[in-house]
């Protein structure tokens, strides 16, 4: 009922709490002298279900049979309507529609840690839509019983607040949960367990790792556990990995030796515990311990390459390059690289430690046989040295790979292909594909990239340090013992027409012809590999089509003669550049008048 109503009553039969699908009778009746004044027979009683009129009747009372009420609460309000006045609320009542509780399922109990308390969980089943009280009962040896009630509406967990002790680990305890509401009650099946069944140890704590003699091969993991723990499982992985290594140990007593860790690697370690071989459950995993394993001396050998440059009749410049060892080969922080340069016949040797670089340049005589050895050193030692005899890599013309081509292969990749050299192809021990950004000045500071390819390969995909719209000078070397042959080509991964034409900086007259000189297009405006330059000219103030001369692009060329100009005629000249994608806009225009005699 809403409250005690002065004007009348609303009663509900058989009950204001009903099972889903039941029928109820609702009666609205006026109290004496509470009807319409002067016109009691004009009393019009109206029954509302919330805001919807469902029945009305003239008189002192109204009866209504209601079916099909939904789960939950429905409010019925009875109102009185008199002539020439608003409806007046008489009284109201709520009807609560629900279901009896289902049998709670999957009752399970757990005690977290030897000092913890027993707590149980269960599945309630479907919503009753009514206030449902759950009572959890635990009975143990010597007729001991504990009981706890839950006042929460969605109750599926209760903590008894009692601690089971290991004095009699095989003693049986039985738990049962009962659900009660206005429409009925239901109890779970009993769950019977022992101390060992339900105690879930606390996760191990205070995890530490020790490396004897700073060696990764002598590693022990230490931890602390609750007193009754019998089993442990360990899991560990490199911090950058998703896969765990798992180890199960019995009676570890808080320590275990690990034999398969990699050096100089950050690992994550976790441990879990259990009280009994086949009873009970594993603890949660411990908090992670992160630790880095010690360094070991590097394995593997450096990949070394070199470049020779003629300086003068007696000297040459050698530039050595090498690639970093992989993390698994370096096995520590590389502190320096050791480069040894030796003249093989005279035995003279020079050793230098290089830090912070993966290249080294020196000048040596052009005479003699020279060799280099390069190794990488960390705090524990050095890698095996990579030895290279310095030779003229392109000397053996018969070893030069044939039909070298370079084609764009998707974004920022170039596919280099070649044919084996004419000389016995089986003599080739390996190919080296080398590439560097093309700089018109032949700048030796430009980074060098290379990859090695097996002797039976005739193609290589280069992708490292390849940028769009940049031209690369690509060389393919065929190496055989102390000989080498090479071929080169220009290539780019992506190209478009150059952004500008060459800038003519001078036009000079020489014996009736002219020599045009120009500045190279800046590298960032070339937009790929240049194929040709075009020189255009036409008579000043003429509307005729310009004449042109097309010159194949060569890196070092910056001038070209033209001998088809007429004397004492003023010409306008300009230049463009072409890539495979098209022609640039005009460079600057220059006027010139040849002074020489007419033929």
């Amino acid at each position: 009922k809403i409250d005690a109503c002065k004007r009348g009553d609303v009663t509900v039969k058989p009950s204001h709490v009903i099972l889903l699908g039941s029928t109820v009778n609702i009666t609205c009746s006026l109290k004496p002298r509470q009807g319409c004044f002067h016109y009691s027979r004009r009393n019009k009683l109206i029954l509302y279900k919330f805001d919807r009129r469902i029945n009305f009747h003239h008189g002192h009372s109204l009866n209504s049979q209601v079916t099909g009420l939904p789960l939950g609460t429905t409010l019925f309000v009875c109102k009185l309507a008199c002539i020439n006045s608003d409806e007046i609320q008489i009284c109201g009542a709520e009807i609560f529609v629900g279901v009896a509780p289902e049998q709670p399922q999957n009752l399970s109990c757990i005690q977290k840690g030897e000092q913890g308390t027993v707590a149980c969980t269960w599945e309630r089943g479907r919503d009753t839509h009514l206030y449902t009280e759950y009572t959890l009962q635990l009975s143990g040896p010597k007729n001991l019983t504990w009981q706890k009630q839950c006042k929460d509406i969605y109750c599926d967990y209760l903590d008894f607040g009692i601690n089971l002790t290991p004095e009699s680990p095989e003693s049986n305890f039985t738990a049962k949960v009962t659900a009660v509401n206005s429409l009925g009650s239901s109890s779970s099946l009993p769950s019977t367990f022992t101390f060992l069944d339900i105690v879930r140890p606390l996760p191990p704590w205070d995890i530490r790792i020790k490396f004897q003699k700073a060696s990764v091969s002598r590693c022990t993991l230490y931890w602390r556990d609750e007193g009754l723990v019998l089993l442990n499982r360990l899991r560990y992985r490199p911090s950058n990995s998703r896969l765990w290594n798992m180890v199960n140990v019995t009676k570890a007593k808080g320590r275990h030796d690990l034999l398969d860790l990699k050096p100089f690697t950050e690992y994550e370690f976790q441990i879990s515990s259990k009280l009994h071989l086949y009873k009970g459950s594993w603890s949660d995993w411990s908090e992670s311990l992160r630790a880095q394993t010690p360094e070991e001396e590097p394995t593997g050998m450096l990949d070394v390459w070199y470049m020779k440059r003629h300086i003068d009749y007696s000297r040459q410049q050698i530039s050595l390059f090498w690639k970093n060892l992989s993390v698994s080969e370096a096995r520590g922080k590389i502190l320096h690289y050791q480069v040894t340069l030796q003249e093989l016949t005279g035995g003279k040797a020079m050793t230098q430690n290089i830090t912070g670089h993966t290249s080294w340049t020196t000048v040596i005589p052009r005479t003699g046989n020279w060799a280099v050895a390069v190794s990488a050193a960390n705090s524990k030692g050095s890698s095996l040295p990579t030895r290279i005899n310095i030779m003229n890599l392109c000397e053996a013309g018969l070893l030069a790979p044939r039909q070298v081509s370079a084609n764009s292969e998707g974004m920022d990749n170039i596919l280099v292909t070649w044919q084996p050299p004419r000389k016995d192809p089986s003599a080739v021990q390996e190919y080296v594909v080398e590439w560097r950004e093309l700089h018109p000045g032949g700048d030796t500071q430009v980074p060098l990239n290379w990859l090695r390819s097996r002797p039976y390969n005739v193609s290589a995909l280069i992708s490292e340090n390849i940028k769009s719209y940049i031209c690369y000078e690509i060389r393919v070397y065929a190496l055989s013992g102390d000989q080498g042959g090479c071929s080169s080509i220009l290539g780019n991964s992506k190209h478009k027409a150059p952004l500008s034409g060459p800038h003519i900086n001078a036009i000079t007259e020489e014996k009736g012809s002219i020599l045009i000189s120009w500045n190279s297009i800046p590298v960032q405006e070339q937009m790929g590999c240049l194929l040709h330059y075009r020189i255009y000219w036409k008579e000043r103030d003429s509307n005729s089509q310009p004449q042109l001369c097309e010159i194949p692009y060569r890196v070092s060329q910056n001038s070209h003669p033209i001998n088809s100009l007429q004397p004492r005629v003023t010409y306008v000249l300009w230049m463009t550049a072409l890539t495979a994608a098209g022609e640039s806009s005009h460079g600057n225009e220059r006027e010139f008048c040849l002074q020489g005699k007419a033929n």
């Epitope: 009922k1 609460t73 409010l75 609560f96 009514l130 929460d152 509406i153």
Partner: nanobody, 115 residues
Framework: QVQLQESGGGLVQPGGSLRLSCTAS????????MDWYRQAPGNEREWVAS???????YYDGSAKGRFTISRDNAKMTVYLQMNSLKPEDTAVYYC?????????WGQGTQVTVSS
């Protein structure tokens, strides 16, 4: 045990607006309707609006079109937004949670509509 506390009442001019709030303690309210009632001086308490546990709103004829009921189960709070207020809306407004064990009522908050 459920406790209800209303707030938001006050003096407002005709045509004005107010927003009433009612906050419950006790999580059981989330399975029940939450209602607003009012009692004008010398009159009986009358139903104004209800909202079901699933959020369906219902209004008495006098409130329809002007009042809006809403609830926030996470905050265990029901609201009544009252617009276009009239002098005849002057009353003490009560919040109620009906349960099968009995009804829980708040203490009420006074709303006065007067120029």
């Amino acid at each position: 045990q459920v406790q209800l506390q209303e707030s938001g009442g006050g003096l407002v001019q005709p045509g004005g607006s107010l927003r009433l709030s009612c906050t419950a303690s006790g999580s059981i309210v989330s399975i029940y309707n939450m209602d607003w009632y009012r009692q004008a001086p010398g009159n009986e308490r009358e139903w104004v609006a209800s909202i079901t546990s699933s959020g369906d709103p219902y209004y008495d004829g006098s409130a329809k079109g002007r009042f809006t009921i809403s609830r926030d189960n996470a905050k265990m709070t029901v609201y009544l937004q009252m617009n276009s207020l009239k002098p005849e809306d002057t009353a003490v407004y009560y919040c109620k949670v009906p349960t099968e064990k009995g009804n829980y009522w708040g203490q009420g908050t006074q709303v006065t509509v007067s120029s």
